[in-house]
Interface confidence: low
């Protein structure tokens, strides 16, 4: 089933309106903001989630990038245009006709322009680096235990196939999770790494998108893993196109 039958809710997305109006009285859910039907058996796309959240306050993040082509989401929240499948449209424009190109996770990858700006294709983000700093603990976590726990989390909570968790690096207090997913690797039904990363980001911030599953309680061998800082870097299959002015 696509949504919880007993009280007609969407387990994977609380930013929905649900009603038992499907075939045979089946519970069906639509995303707030867009009204698009969502599959409650999997993660909702980041685009539809951002659309539902468009009135939330802006949150900007900046830190040194790990490579010249990595992107950080410094623009924060915006009301995106999503395609009929719920993916980001390659070109996004605001109400003042300022436009820019985004990647598959909705992060700007070009300078801002006007309505004449062309974004020929939605460029896929194939590598996501999630950089975490955990709060001080009595000692360092065991690397292999940490690795196993984070892989389990992405598999069980976010339904991301284990093959897409490329590596877990640990140098106390910094944890780095690498997600990799090329266009050719992603099969129908596979959770997108961008969506998994977004759900994880919201969980870490205590803003869980799951309905009635409680917040994220991360433990490694029973020891709570409390994150005090998160930064996410996005690498695209085609490098971004910014002017030199922005890079200085």
């Amino acid at each position: 089933h696509t949504a919880a039958q007993d009280n007609c809710t969407c387990p994977t997305n609380k930013m929905t309106v649900c009603s038992p109006d499907g075939p045979g009285g089946r519970c069906q859910c639509r995303a707030l903001g867009s009204g698009m039907a969502v599959d409650c058996s999997t993660l909702t796309s980041k685009c539809l989630l951002l659309k539902a959240r468009m009135s939330a306050p802006k949150n900007a993040r900046t830190l040194v990038r790990p490579s010249e082509h990595a992107l950080v989401d410094n623009d924060g929240l915006y009301d995106p245009d999503c395609d009929p499948e719920g993916r980001f449209k390659a070109r996004q424009c605001n109400q003042t006709s300022v436009c820019w190109c985004v990647n598959s996770v909705g992060v700007r990858r070009t300078d801002k322009g006007d309505l004449s700006l062309r974004c020929d294709e939605l460029v896929r983000t194939h590598h996501i680096l999630i950089d975490l700093r955990h709060r001080p603990t009595a000692g360092a976590f065991n690397h292999s235990d940490l690795d196993a726990e984070l892989r389990r989390l992405f598999r069980e909570r976010y339904r991301l196939h284990p093959k897409f968790v490329a590596a877990v690096h640990y140098e106390q207090p910094t944890i780095q999770i690498e997600l990799r997913q090329n266009t050719s690797q992603k099969a129908a039904g596979d959770v997108d790494i961008g969506d998994a990363a977004y759900y994880f980001e919201r969980d870490i911030k205590g803003e869980s998108l799951f309905q009635g599953r409680g917040g994220l309680d991360l433990r490694v061998r029973g020891e709570p893993l409390q994150v005090e800082r998160t930064l996410i870097y996005y690498l695209d299959e085609i490098p971004p196109k910014f002017s030199m002015k922005r890079l200085t």
Epitope: G22, Q28, S34, G35, M36, A37, P84, E85, L115
Partner: antibody, heavy 121, light 107 residues
Framework: QVQLVQSGAEVKKPGASVKVSCKAS????????MQWVRQAPGQGLEWMGW????????KYAEDFKGRVTISADTSTSTAYLQLSSLKSEDTAVYYC??????????????WGQGTLVTVSS | DIQMTQSPSSLSASVGDRVTITCKAS??????VAWYQQKPGKAPKLLIY???HRYTGVPSRFSGSGSGTDFTLTISSLQPEDFAVYYC?????????FGQGTKLEIK
């Protein structure tokens, strides 16, 4: 490839009803809405209504309310348009067309071939 | 209801010409306008959606622009297969409404 195949032409008498079918293939039926548009001979396009195939909820244009019923059978990926109390002015080609579910996506990217409905005594 | 007014209603042009068709909405529809091409006896075909997004497989000579109430479809260099009727449609709010059509004929 994505296709919408409609039922054949119909000739009806005034006061009768007609039911036009539209079978979808090449995509997951419930991921897109189904719209109905008609075109009288030599005239422009007129929107009649649509159905959210995921929820099964239809929405009708005011001019057709009470006379039109749009439905969908997800098991056969088929949408239906039923128009009752037919008048000669209802003579037109009736098209089904695919759209997204949300308001940003109510443009029609795939169309059926059209079904000519002739109302004549 | 939102009225969509197209101009001109008919237009004669030659192969190679640059042609512009305009569509005016009776109220603000953001960028939610689509353009279709229809040939006799055939279903319409989507050319442009969301005012300026060219649909898959549509030749680059077709472009759309505009926001708010004023929209334009431009064919940069007319080809023989472009002679047809063109419709604009607002996909901002129901009831969805179309322009009355522009018939593009060979001069």
């Amino acid at each position: 490839q994505v296709q919408l195949v409609q039922s054949g032409a119909e000739v009806k008498k005034p006061g009768a009803s007609v039911k036009v079918s539209c079978k979808a293939s090449g995509y997951t039926f419930t991921t897109a809405g189904m719209q109905w548009v008609r075109q009288a001979p030599g005239q422009g396009l007129e929107w009649m209504g649509w159905i959210n195939t995921h929820s099964g909820v239809p929405k009708y244009a005011e001019d057709f309310k009470g006379r039109v019923t749009i439905s969908a059978d997800t098991s056969t990926s088929t949408a239906y348009l039923q128009l009752s109390s037919l008048k000669s002015e209802d003579t037109a080609v009736y098209y089904c067309a695919r759209s997204g579910h949300g308001s940003s996506y109510w443009y029609f990217d795939v169309w059926g071939q059209g079904t000519l409905v002739t109302v004549s005594s | 209801d939102i009225q969509m007014t197209q101009s001109p209603s008919s237009l004669s042009a030659s192969v190679g010409d640059r042609v512009t068709i305009t569509c005016k909405a009776s109220q603000d529809v953001s960028t939610a306008v689509a353009w279709y091409q229809q040939k006799p006896g055939k279903a319409p075909k989507l050319l442009i959606y969301s005012a300026s997004h060219r649909y898959t497989g549509v030749p680059s000579r077709f472009s759309g622009s505009g926001s708010g109430t004023d929209f334009t479809l431009t064919i940069s260099s007319l080809q023989p297969e472009d002679f047809a009727v063109y419709y604009c449609q607002q996909h901002y709010i129901t009831p969805l409404t179309f322009g009355q059509g522009t018939k593009l004929e060979i001069k």
